[in-house]
């Protein structure tokens, strides 16, 4: 049994780091493998993560952490029974993938404006709370070419757009994702999408 692709890990900079790797053949990850991880700290102890299958030869493990600070460094040991298959280290602050925003809502009751709001996925005491910016994706269910991205570079988790910028009388979907430039993160996963009917009517012209 050998590791084909070494583990790579990303942290949500809160409580979970996810490590993925590939074996050289079909593997029952949860019964055959264990990933041991330990914070490099005088009083820390090793924790065991039981991996799950992620495709035939792929494995994924979710490492639970109390929290994360920039100085944290973890040692990682991948075991198959008594055999050490791979040894490495992981600094969560250098491999961050933020949590996806939640509770995306489209408010259509504001006269000519669509207001999209969502929730910041971090608590106020987390470093990323005040450093996230967002991308909002809006697309038409009827027309695949009607697909747009709005970059939200301010901290408030909301976006206002004129209803007239979208076609009237058809259904749209929206989703949102987050990243933090200052922490050099990747983009988060997209939030679940939300659907609404754009019923904006052009005002009658006065002659």
């Amino acid at each position: 049994m050998k590791v084909l692709q070494e583990p790579t890990c990303v942290s949500d900079y809160m409580s979970i780091s996810t490590c993925e790797w590939k074996m050289n053949g079909p593997t029952n990850c949860s019964t055959e493998l264990r990933l041991l991880y330990q914070l490099v700290f005088l009083l820390s102890e090793a924790h065991t993560c039981i991996p799950e299958n992620n495709g035939g030869a792929g494995c994924v493990c979710h490492l639970l952490m109390d929290d994360v600070v920039s100085a944290d460094n973890y040692t990682l040991d991948l075991w198959a029974g008594q055999q050490l298959l791979w040894k490495g280290s992981f600094k969560p602050s250098e491999h961050v993938k933020p949590r996806a925003p939640g509770n995306l809502t489209v408010h259509t009751n504001v006269s000519d404006t669509l207001l999209l709001t969502w929730s910041n996925p971090y608590p106020p005491d987390n470093y990323l709370y005040n450093h996230l910016t967002y991308a909002v994706n809006i697309w038409s269910e009827n027309d695949p070419a009607d697909f747009r991205i709005y970059n939200v570079t301010y901290l408030e988790p909301s976006l206002r757009i004129a209803a007239s910028t979208l076609k009237s009388g058809i259904s749209y979907r929206a989703r949102v994702r987050a990243w933090a430039q200052c922490a050099n993160t990747t983009w988060s996963e997209w939030s679940p999408s939300t659907k609404w009917h754009n019923s904006y009517r052009e005002p009658f012209e006065q002659h």
Epitope: L42, L43, S44, E45
Partner: antibody, heavy 116, light 111 residues
Framework: EVQLLESGGGLVQPGGSLRLSCAAS????????MAWVRQAPGKGLEWVSA????????YYADSVKGRFTISRDNSKNTLYLQMNSLRAEDTAVYYC?????????WGQGTLVTVSS | QSVLTQPPSASGTPGQRVTISCSGS????????FNWYQQLPGTAPKLLIY???HRPSGVPDRFSGSKSGTSASLAISGLRSEDEADYYC???????????LGGGTKLTVLG
């Protein structure tokens, strides 16, 4: 709410023994390393000893090595410090502290006086 | 003699910004993070800053920490009378397999 309550302090003669206890509540005791820190009257803080969450690894300050023993009972959520061969310079308030990178929660302390 | 050196005293007037330093000796390993504790008169110490610059929840953002090599500093802005206390720096010393604490700095708020 995290609470740490020390007990067992008192007056003891030089060469005597004392056992301090620290009852923990409000958090999962078995998941945290713990430590003892002391403060002699009018002096600064001095780290005494620390123990990992399972008790597998233990550390002592040079000043108490060989005389003090730290231990824990995770089933009772209690930390202990057995102090033997006590000296006058061990007179201090002894604080129990939870460890999360630093000493993030402290008890109110128990006074140990070593005097003849 | 502590491995970490702090000034024995510091002072400032209300509203001022004061800084307390904590210096490791030249041979002191610089891999560890610094922590800061506040001890108000007659009470147990309280964690103020951990891992160089992180504030536990409930600690006002008037308190900030920084690290440079083997030294650290604690800054208190908008000084208040209730900040009058003893302040200690500390770090895990992996060469000693233990925790080292500075001698403490007594902060006096004047006026």
């Amino acid at each position: 709410e995290v609470q740490l309550l020390e007990s067992g302090g008192g007056l003891v003669q030089p060469g005597g023994s004392l056992r301090l206890s620290c009852a923990a509540s409000g958090f999962t005791f078995s998941r945290h390393a713990m430590a003892w820190v002391r403060q002699a009257p009018g002096k600064g803080l001095e780290w005494v000893s620390a123990i990992t969450s399972s008790g597998r690894s233990i550390y002592y300050a040079d000043s108490v090595k060989g005389r003090f023993t730290i231990s824990r009972d995770n089933s009772k959520n209690t930390l202990y410090l057995q102090m033997n061969s006590l000296r006058a310079e061990d007179t201090a308030v002894y604080y129990c502290a939870r460890v999360h990178r630093a000493f993030d929660y402290w008890g109110q302390g128990t006074l140990v006086t070593v005097s003849s | 003699q502590s491995v970490l050196t702090q000034p024995p005293s510091a002072s400032g007037t209300p509203g001022q910004r004061v800084t307390i330093s904590c210096s490791g000796s030249p041979l002191f390993p610089d891999s560890g993070s610094f922590n800061w504790y506040q001890q108000l008169p007659g009470t147990a110490p309280k964690l103020l800053i951990y891992a160089d610059s992180h504030r536990p929840s409930g600690v006002p953002d008037r308190f900030s920490g920084s690290k440079s090599g083997t030294s650290a500093s604690l800054a208190i802005s908008g000084l208040r009378s209730e900040d009058e206390a003893d302040y200690y720096c500390g770090t895990w010393d992996y060469s000693l397999s233990g925790y080292v604490l500075g001698g403490g700095t007594k902060l006096t708020v004047l006026g």
